[in-house]
């Protein structure tokens, strides 16, 4: 007998073909011999089965000897053996209906777990294989678990249910609630305006919650809260902000903070947290601020950086159009009795300049 797999809530066509391409009598029955539908004259008649109001047939195909039954809004309990009686012969079709659903909300925070549960008819022994948008493959039986969701797990998961060498495909949209980046670093010269941006890796119709930026300055012994804010329907409103520094915050998404001036005492790292309404847990993004200062005091030209820099970064002082250079994998470099001219202080990572500050040394007569 033929096996057909269907999806819960979906529509399925069970085919039944007569050898002669002409309109003839036919009936569809279930395994209990209860009539579902059939032909009487040119009229489609429905029987007393529970399926009748969801079953249909295409009159336009009867002339071609095709007497299929279409079942809409499939339920797991529609799984059964259906019998098509046409031309004094019986065709049997076994219909197996499966459902695959996420146990919780499909909008999950990064790090949370996802469980997919398979609903299947009694007596079936299906296998399930799911593929994440990032190409991760997970296999299972009645349940599939993804212990720790990552940003790249956001999107459409494709799950294939297999039974009796037949397959049916489910698509489940999963939204991982996270910031686009786990961490970002802003490099600024002293005195420059600093822009911090915290774009989200998802979009929601209504986005409501509250957030806070905690800051650990390199020079400070403890961290402090720089700003707290509310988010209501994608509108941002500041609740509380420190006096020093006096941060400004954009009223619309993406979350955007402006520090009027980059100063050495602000260099350090922060953690922006966002708690979303009706969600347990918080979204996090780390942000770092590196500040550069170039100064000349008496016969000493100094370049310094403050903030979280990796040991492999190079700090250099270089005289423009001249070979004179001093470089160190350190947070400060200096030149004694520097030549007159335009000096450049460069913070580089493997030759790529991250930050640059120019200082003019005037000749001393």
């Amino acid at each position: 007998k033929k096996v057909v797999l269907g999806k819960k809530g979906d529509t399925v066509e069970l085919t039944c073909n007569a050898s002669q391409k002409k309109n003839t009598q036919f009936h569809w029955k279930n395994s209990n011999q209860i009539k579902i539908l059939g032909i009487q004259g040119l009229f489609l008649t429905k029987g007393p089965s529970k399926l009748s109001d969801r079953a249909d047939s295409r009159k336009s195909l009867w002339d071609q000897g095709c007497f299929s039954m279409i079942i809409k809004n499939l339920k797991i309990e529609d799984s059964d053996t259906y019998i098509c009686e046409v031309e004094n012969k019986k065709e049997e079709v076994e219909l197996l209906v499966f459902g695959l659903t996420a146990n919780s909300d499909t909008h999950l925070l990064e790090g949370q777990s996802l469980t997919l549960t398979l609903e299947s008819p009694p007596g079936s022994s299906p296998s399930v294989k799911c593929r994440s948008p990032g190409g991760k493959n997970i296999q299972g039986g009645r349940t599939i678990s993804v212990p720790q969701l990552e940003r790249q797990d956001s999107g459409t998961w494709t799950c294939t249910v297999s039974q009796d060498q037949k397959t049916v495909e489910f698509k489940i949209d999963i939204v991982v609630l996270a910031f686009q980046k786990a961490s970002s670093t802003v490099y600024k010269k002293e005195g420059e305006q600093v822009e911090f941006s915290f774009p989200l890796a998802f979009t929601l119709e209504k986005l409501t919650g509250s957030g806070e930026l905690w800051w650990q300055a390199e020079r400070a012994s403890s961290s402090k809260s720089w700003i707290t804010f509310d988010l209501k329907n994608k509108e941002v409103s500041v609740k509380r902000v420190t006096q020093d520094p006096k941060l400004q915050m954009g009223k619309k998404l993406p979350l955007h903070l402006t520090l009027p001036q980059a100063l050495p005492q602000y260099a350090g790292s922060g953690n922006l947290t966002l708690a979303l309404e009706a969600k347990t847990g918080k979204l996090h993004q780390e942000v770092n601020l590196v500040v550069m200062r170039a100064t000349q005091f008496q016969e000493n030209l100094t370049c310094e950086v403050w903030g979280p820099t990796s040991p492999k970064l190079t700090l250099s002082l270089k005289l423009e159009n001249k070979g004179a250079t001093v470089s160190k994998q350190a947070k400060a470099v200096w030149v004694l009795n520097p030549e007159a001219g335009m000096w450049q202080c460069l913070l580089s990572d493997s030759g790529q300049v991250l930050l640059e500050s120019n200082i003019k040394v005037v000749p001393t007569w």
Partner: antibody, heavy 115, light 107 residues
């Protein structure tokens, strides 16, 4: 609730091939047949043809020699190609879902054939 | 092909009126007939199928009847929203065919 969204070139020259695609959102793609219908002031509503998930097609005999309907089940999309168009093919083209009746329709695409 | 002929091609009526539109098939189609409503710039909308069954969400002032070759669509009490063009369609055999339409206008 199922939604059908269609797109394709709107202005063609005679002898070119008309190409339209329809995407199905929020409903079952399997079990149904997916049709193309056109509407012109001269000929009213005219059924062009249909396809199902497994690629089985039925065409209007009056257009059969020029029509190809194809399906991409991975995207829940189906497409219409009508070759060697003339000014008589100028119409609003609709995609629609059907078992016996057209119960869901696309927004329509105006296709103009002009030299 | 089965020809579907609608009459009248246009009708003028007032709010509250009872309106009947007829559709005749060139050969017997039992009850394999549907009625659609279309407003300017929009796609047709299914009102009645199987000659007399209501599509969900369709107001009860719309009703369909008939079998074989002669069918009618009746609007018991016209509302402003009902002024549109109405089409019948047969699903008895390929190719599916439509009537030429009946335009319902405000008197």
């Amino acid at each position: 609730q199922v939604q059908l969204q269609q797109w394709g070139a709107g202005l063609l020259k005679p002898s070119e091939t008309l190409s339209l695609t329809c995407a199905v959102y929020g409903g079952s793609f399997s079990g149904y047949y997916w049709s193309w219908i056109r509407q012109s002031p001269g000929k009213g509503l005219e059924w062009i043809g249909e396809i199902n998930q497994s690629g089985s097609t039925n065409y209007n005999p009056s257009l059969k020699s020029r029509v190809t309907i194809s399906v991409d089940t991975s995207k829940d999309q189906f497409s219409l190609k009508l070759s060697s168009v003339t000014a008589a093919d100028t119409a609003v083209y609709y995609c629609a879902r059907v078992i016996n009746w057209f119960d869901s329709w696309g927004q329509g695409s105006l296709v103009t054939v002009s030299s | 092909d089965i020809q579907m002929t609608q009459s009248p091609s246009s009708v003028s009526a007032s709010v509250g009126d009872r309106v009947t539109i007829t559709c005749r098939a060139s050969q017997g189609i039992s009850s394999w007939l549907a009625w659609y409503q279309q407003k300017p710039g929009k796609a047709p909308k299914l009102l009645i199928y199987d000659a007399s069954s209501f599509q969900s969400g369709v107001p009860s002032r719309f009703s369909g009847s008939g079998s074989g070759t002669d069918f009618t669509l009746t609007i018991s009490s016209l509302q402003t929203d009902d002024f549109a063009t109405y089409y019948c369609q047969q699903a008895n055999s390929f190719p599916y065919t439509f009537g030429q339409g009946t335009k319902l206008e405000i008197k």
